[in-house]
Interface confidence: low
């Protein structure tokens, strides 16, 4: 039934960067300035989105695909397509609701974006904290006294802590 | 510390699709873009496109859009490069780089893999 | 998309000499350029960032400058480790676009 119904219909035969226009019989029209559809069949094209204030322009909106946003120095992009922009702080500290705040003791953060983790908990892993954690960098765990032999790696650094999430390239 | 292995030299015949490696080790593998660029004999370099690992998220020159294909394994951290029908066009030198965030720079590049396409 | 252009492909110069290598956009990238060293064995190392910012573990003789679309590299005590190509890249807009180039050779 669907493909029948698409071959009735002559909206299906117009291509991505165009719609069917119901007002010239329904003919195919280009999408008019600062607009785009990114799909055949469309009956109205979508209005591109503005890159502005805080977000700059990482792709120009082209009459098949939308524009895409990051965000100027100073700040990195949340959520999905960039759709907010928060505020960096140095690398040993977190945004808060006050603005950017130093980590607590016990803490650090070795990016600008992100919230303060915990140090790594060395004795845990039944290691010795061979280099103390700052407010930017985790600690170094090293073998317990046990382990150091002849040949032996002194140095296990942990994992760093990075947020995933996605970030415009 | 980072580092972006690439194997020295691959040969291919034209026409035969092929992928070429970058493994990744020093650094939390998908918190970094990976970037492809290009560099035919004696010439400049050229951006092919790159890849978030996290989501595999891609961007690519339209230039190239037909040509490379960018994909990621995360468990081995490693990101590889699909050339689609390769000609002698495409014989060159090809350095993967990584890019941190937004318009930062390509901090650390790969030795690059010298690949030959002939018959 | 933005072209990047090094008016000089190649350039000679004595040790000890002060270098400065161009570099121009087709428009304004905001400062967003970035500079590269590629040794003759194909090697390729970030010196700086950011117009002006030095990438760690690079030698304080190398330093950057300019706005707008015009940008330069200056190295001010050319020592033989030096000898490499340098590119400029533009980091404001997709696609990233590189200059052709700048050989730098010993007289």
């Known amino acids: 039934f669907e493909r029948t119904r698409s071959l009735q219909d002559p909206c299906s035969n117009c291509p991505a960067g165009t719609f069917c226009d119901n007002n010239r019989n329904q003919i195919c029209s280009p999408c008019p300035p600062n607009s785009f559809s990114s799909a055949g069949g469309q009956r109205t094209c979508d209005i591109c989105r503005q890159c502005k204030g805080v977000f700059r322009t990482r792709k120009e909106c082209s009459s098949t695909s939308n524009a895409e946003c990051d965000c100027t120095p100073g700040f990195h992009c949340l959520g999905a397509g960039c759709s907010m922009c928060e505020q960096d702080c140095k690398q040993g500290q977190e945004l808060t609701k006050k603005g950017c705040k130093d980590c607590c003791f016990g803490t650090f953060n070795d990016q600008k974006r992100g919230i303060c983790r915990p140090w790594t908990n060395c004795s845990l892993d039944g290691k010795s904290v061979l280099v103390n954690g700052t407010k930017e960098r985790d600690v170094v765990c090293g073998p317990s006294p046990a382990d150091l032999s002849p040949g032996a790696s002194s140095v296990t650094p942990p994992a760093p802590a990075r947020e995933p999430g996605h970030s415009p390239q | 510390q980072v580092q972006l292995q690439q194997p020295g030299a691959e040969l291919v015949r034209p026409g035969a699709s092929m992928k070429l490696s970058c493994k990744a080790s020093?650094?939390?593998?998908?918190?970094?873009?990976i970037n492809w660029v290009k560099q035919r004999p004696g010439q400049g370099l050229e951006w092919i496109g790159n890849?978030?690992?996290?989501?595999?998220?891609?961007n690519y020159n339209q230039k190239f859009k037909d040509k490379a294909t960018l994909t990621v394994d995360k468990s081995s951290s490693t990101a590889y490069m699909q050339l689609s029908s390769p000609t002698s066009e495409d014989s060159a030198v090809y350095y993967c780089?990584?890019?941190?965030?937004?318009?930062?720079?390509?901090?650390?590049w790969g030795q690059g893999t010298t690949l030959t396409v002939s018959s | 998309d933005i072209q990047m252009t090094q008016t000089t492909s190649s350039l000679s110069a004595s040790l000890g000499d002060r270098v400065t290598i161009s570099c121009r956009a087709s428009?304004?990238?905001?400062?967003?350029l970035n500079w590269y060293q590629q040794k003759p064995d194909g090697t390729v190392k970030l010196l700086i960032y950011?117009?002006?910012r030095l990438h760690s573990g690079v030698p304080p003789r190398f330093s950057g400058s300019g706005s707008g679309t015009n940008y330069s590299l200056t190295i001010s005590n050319l020592e033989q480790e030096d000898i490499a190509t340098y590119f400029c890249?533009?980091?404001?807009?997709?696609?990233?676009?590189f200059g052709g180039g700048t050989k730098l050779e010993i007289k």
């Open positions: 780089t990584r890019l941190y965030y937004g318009s930062s720079p390509f901090d650390y």
């Open positions: 020093g650094y939390t593998f998908t918190s970094y873009w």
């Open positions: 890849i978030y690992p996290s989501d595999s998220y891609t």
């Open positions: 428009q304004d990238i905001s400062n967003y």
């Open positions: 950011h117009t002006s």
């Open positions: 890249q533009q980091g404001h807009t997709l696609p990233r676009t």
